[in-house]
Amino acid sequence: RQQWELQGDRRCQSQLERANLRPCEQHLMQKIQRDEDSYGRDPYSPSQDPYSPSPYDRRGAGSSQHQERCCNELNEFENNQRCMCEALQQIMENQSDRLQGRQQEQQFKRELRNLPQQCGLRAPQRCDLEVESGGRDRY
């Protein structure tokens, strides 16, 4: 059993190294920014509109292209739920330092959890996506 798990871990590791998760990251960031733009305001301060909608984000064409490429990548993890979870964790880790607000972080996590389902894949049952709040700047 241990031997099997070790092989599974190795296989997952090499799958993760081969995978290009950037389209997923691009799709998710565009999605949460588009949602915020469409509300047109920071929900926490009703008197202040932090952003005005961007024509690029409003179009959404780039995002659906990213989603398609993202789903193709995630498809590789379909038969390994634990590895799928690790892929989602890696996406969260890669973007955590871009999210400097609690609301943005929670929304990103929500969309990330829904990602496998959006791709018509099984979502991992238990997958901890917690990172240090506010992310870390990585160089």
């Epitope: 990251e25 960031m29 920071d42 932090p50 780039g62 890669n94 400097q100 609301q103 506010g134 700047d137």
Partner: antibody, heavy 118, light 111 residues
Framework: QVQLVESGGGVVQPGRSLRLSCAAS????????MHWVRRSPDKGLEWVAA????????YYADSVKGRFTISRDSSKNTLFLQMDSLRVEDTAVYYC???????????WGQGTLVTVSS | DIVMTQSPLSLPVTPGEPASISCRSS???????????LDWYLQKPGQSPQLLIY???KRASGVPDRFSGSGSGTDFTLKISRVEAEDVGVYYC????????FGQGTKVEIK
């Protein structure tokens, strides 16, 4: 409406310390990264430090690393900047600013002047 | 560290005429998520800085549409299609890819 009010500035001698405060109201203070930025006549705007909403992560400009400490008190909606070993080149107007959530500096205070002079 | 370089440092303008400011970074500001982490700020005389443009080309709310941002990678431009008297002040670009760094500023004044 959104208000960020800095205080604690003043005239201080080189090598001494000063503690700046920034009181926030009308914003979700505890849900965003907060920053300190300074403006001096010779250098323009210079980002100084930032602290994540949970207070776990702190970031500093190289010019202040090891001398300045950023912190926040969530219960009082207040941001702090402890400035030790002050130098003449730290003379500036210090602003606190709230992050947009995507690394832009969205809301700014009116600033407090710090003068380091012998 | 990323170094931000603005030009020109001083820009005399005529109301009604266009104006543009250039900003160059010492390394690409494109994150793996596809966004350029470059903002533009304006500090009017006697006021605190204000956000004009974020992520290279998105206009912050309340900012007149005569302001536009463009560019990608290491080269960015802020354009004012028709300068108005109230646009005077110091304009700064700022990178937010690795921590945060401002350019030296461009002082815009009426001729």
């Amino acid at each position: 409406q959104v208000q960020l009010v800095e205080s604690g500035g003043g005239v201080v001698q080189p090598g001494r310390s000063l503690r700046l405060s920034c009181a926030a109201s009308g914003i979700a203070f505890n849900d965003y990264t907060m920053h300190w930025v300074r403006r001096s006549p010779d250098k323009g705007l210079e980002w100084v430090a930032a602290i994540s909403y949970g207070g776990t992560n702190k970031y500093y400009a190289d010019s202040v690393k090891g001398r300045f400490t950023i912190s926040r008190d969530s219960s009082k909606n207040t941001l702090f900047l402890q400035m030790d070993s002050l130098r003449v080149e730290d003379t500036a107007v210090y602003y606190c600013a709230r992050d947009s959530g995507y690394r832009s500096l969205l809301h700014w205070g009116q600033g407090t002047l710090v003068t380091v002079s012998s | 560290d990323i170094v931000m370089t603005q030009s020109p440092l001083s820009l005399p303008v005529t109301p009604g005429e266009p104006a543009s400011i250039s900003c160059r970074s010492s390394q690409s500001l494109v994150h793996r998520n596809g966004y350029n982490y470059l903002d533009w700020y304006l500090q009017k005389p006697g006021q605190s800085p204000q956000l004009l443009i974020y992520m290279a080309s998105k206009r912050a709310s309340g900012v007149p549409d005569r302001f536009s941002g463009s560019g990608s990678g290491t080269d960015f431009t802020l354009k004012i299609s028709r300068v108005e008297a109230e646009d005077v002040g110091v304009y700064y670009c700022m990178q937010a890819l690795q921590t945060w760094t401002f350019g030296q500023g461009t002082k815009v004044e009426i001729k």
